[in-house]
């Protein structure tokens, strides 16, 4: 059991420790996973290669605020979202929307988080005199992973349960904050 993945009202993905964040729905490609129509076999495509290192995936920069209950981070954090499709590095455009995007005839590789970084953020709560502190785990890089017939849709989903929204009530006035932490710009500590 790991720390949960929260999704706030703006559907921003808030990954926490021990979780693998999921790309936002608009970035998902539902043709990237093995399905029955492929008989569980990786399809042939013109750029067949055995070396995963020859494949690249798109790392989309994603800026968002971290939320926790009624609180929100004082500053936005920037992380990567791993695009759902992988392809030969030489065919990937440098920017989204430029060039022709290579699309294999079936599922073969999946772009997934590779490395994470933890970042301490100051949380501001409505009416609060001082912020709280929380650490979030952010995607630092992505990698292509070859899928086998044993991979299924659930394998790359979040491991945590989606948290219920906290009950609406009076806003917190958190005062629990280290004076030392207040003096530091902790958002950039990592």
């Amino acid at each position: 059991q790991g720390w949960q993945a929260f999704k706030n009202d703006a559907t921003e993905i808030i990954p926490e420790l021990g979780e693998y964040p999921e790309p936002p729905p608009e970035l998902e490609n539902n043709k990237t996973m093995n399905r029955a129509e492929n008989g569980g076999r990786p399809p042939h495509h013109p750029f067949e290669t055995k070396d995963v290192s020859e494949y690249s995936c798109r790392e989309l920069h994603f800026t968002r605020y971290v939320t926790d209950g009624p609180c929100r981070s004082a500053k936005p954090v920037t992380e990567l979202v791993c695009s759902g499709q992988c392809g030969p590095a030489r065919l990937l455009p440098n920017a989204i929307g430029r060039g022709k995007w290579w699309r294999p005839s079936g599922p073969d590789f999946r772009c997934i988080p590779d490395r994470y970084r933890a970042q301490r953020v100051q949380l501001l709560c409505p009416g609060g005199e001082a912020p709280r502190a929380r650490k979030v785990r952010l995607v630092a890089s992505c990698k292509c992973k070859r899928l086998t017939r044993f991979h299924n849709q659930s394998e790359l989903k979040d491991f945590g349960t989606e948290a219920a929204r906290p009950q609406k009530g009076r806003k917190p006035r958190p005062r629990a904050r280290s004076a030392k932490a207040n003096q530091a710009e902790l958002e950039n500590a990592y």
């Epitope: 790991g2 009624p70 709280r132 650490k135 629990a176």
Partner: antibody
Framework: QVQLVQSGAEVKKPGASVKVSCKVS????????QHWVRQAPGKGLEWMGW????????EYASKFQGRVTMTEDTSTDTAYMELSSLRSEDTAVYYC???????????WGQGTTVTVSS | DIQMTQSPSSLSASVGDRVTITCRAS??????LAWYQQKPGKAPKLLIY???TLWSGVPSRFSGSGSGTDFTLTISSLQPEDFATYYC?????????FGGGTKVEIK
């Protein structure tokens, strides 16, 4: 699988110090906040303080200020809590806890019994 | 320090019963409240935080409500593994403080 494994029971004399360790596995300790909570025999829970292993930031309950020191070794993912000038009322089970925030305790160690007796 | 008062201090119930435990803070803590379950000889386990948000892996029969100074933990249908002591904890103001606990025993 997140796990916190604490050091074994200790028996100390009044005035002595005790240092309890807490080995964290499942994620790097620097990615967390470490808390220490104690529970006297048959009593409730008492928060002692938290620390941020990444930057060495600490916040102690005023009751323990000057007597408690919380440190971490990020290379071994181990947290330590040292309590000095022990007295009989410090006899308790000491728990380490960890989490992603400074204000709740997500995962707990099994506890370390510290007995202070002359 | 904020005082957290739980009631009752103990209660007897049967499997299948609906159980309600209350926690009162000595001052407004908004929704900065967590609930923990502790079994004899074991460490506490987080059940609920932000007064009403269920922690990962906790059965849905547990629920929390309240804000300000009055909070409730409800177990909709008590199971054999739920017999334990329950603590509330405020996370609004340092030092964080716990309630005295409510022991749920088998009737």
């Amino acid at each position: 699988q997140v796990q916190l494994v604490q050091s074994g029971a200790e028996v100390k004399k009044p005035g002595a110090s005790v240092k309890v360790s807490c080995k964290v596995s499942g994620f790097p300790i620097k990615d967390t906040f470490q808390h220490w909570v104690r529970q006297a025999p048959g009593k409730g829970l008492e928060w002692m303080g938290w620390s941020d292993p990444e930057i060495g930031d600490t916040e102690y309950a005023s009751k323990f200020q000057g007597r408690v020191t919380m440190t971490e070794d990020t290379s071994t993912d181990t947290a330590y809590m040292e309590l000095s000038s022990l007295r009989s009322e410090d006899t308790a089970v000491y728990y380490c806890a960890t989490g992603d925030t400074t204000y709740k305790f997500d995962f707990w160690g099994q506890g370390t019994t510290v007995t202070v007796s002359s | 320090d904020i005082q957290m008062t739980q009631s009752p201090s103990s209660l007897s119930a049967s499997v299948g019963d609906r159980v309600t435990i209350t926690c009162r803070a000595s001052q407004d803590i908004s929704t900065a409240l967590a609930w923990y379950q502790q079994k004899p000889g074991k460490a506490p386990k987080l059940l609920i935080y932000w007064a009403s948000t269920l922690w990962s892996g906790v059965p849905s029969r547990f629920s929390g409500s309240g804000s300000g100074t009055d909070f409730t933990l409800t177990i909709s249908s008590l199971q054999p593994e739920d017999f334990a002591t329950y603590y509330c904890q405020q996370g609004d103001t340092l030092p964080y403080t716990f309630g005295g606990g409510t022991k749920v025993e088998i009737k």
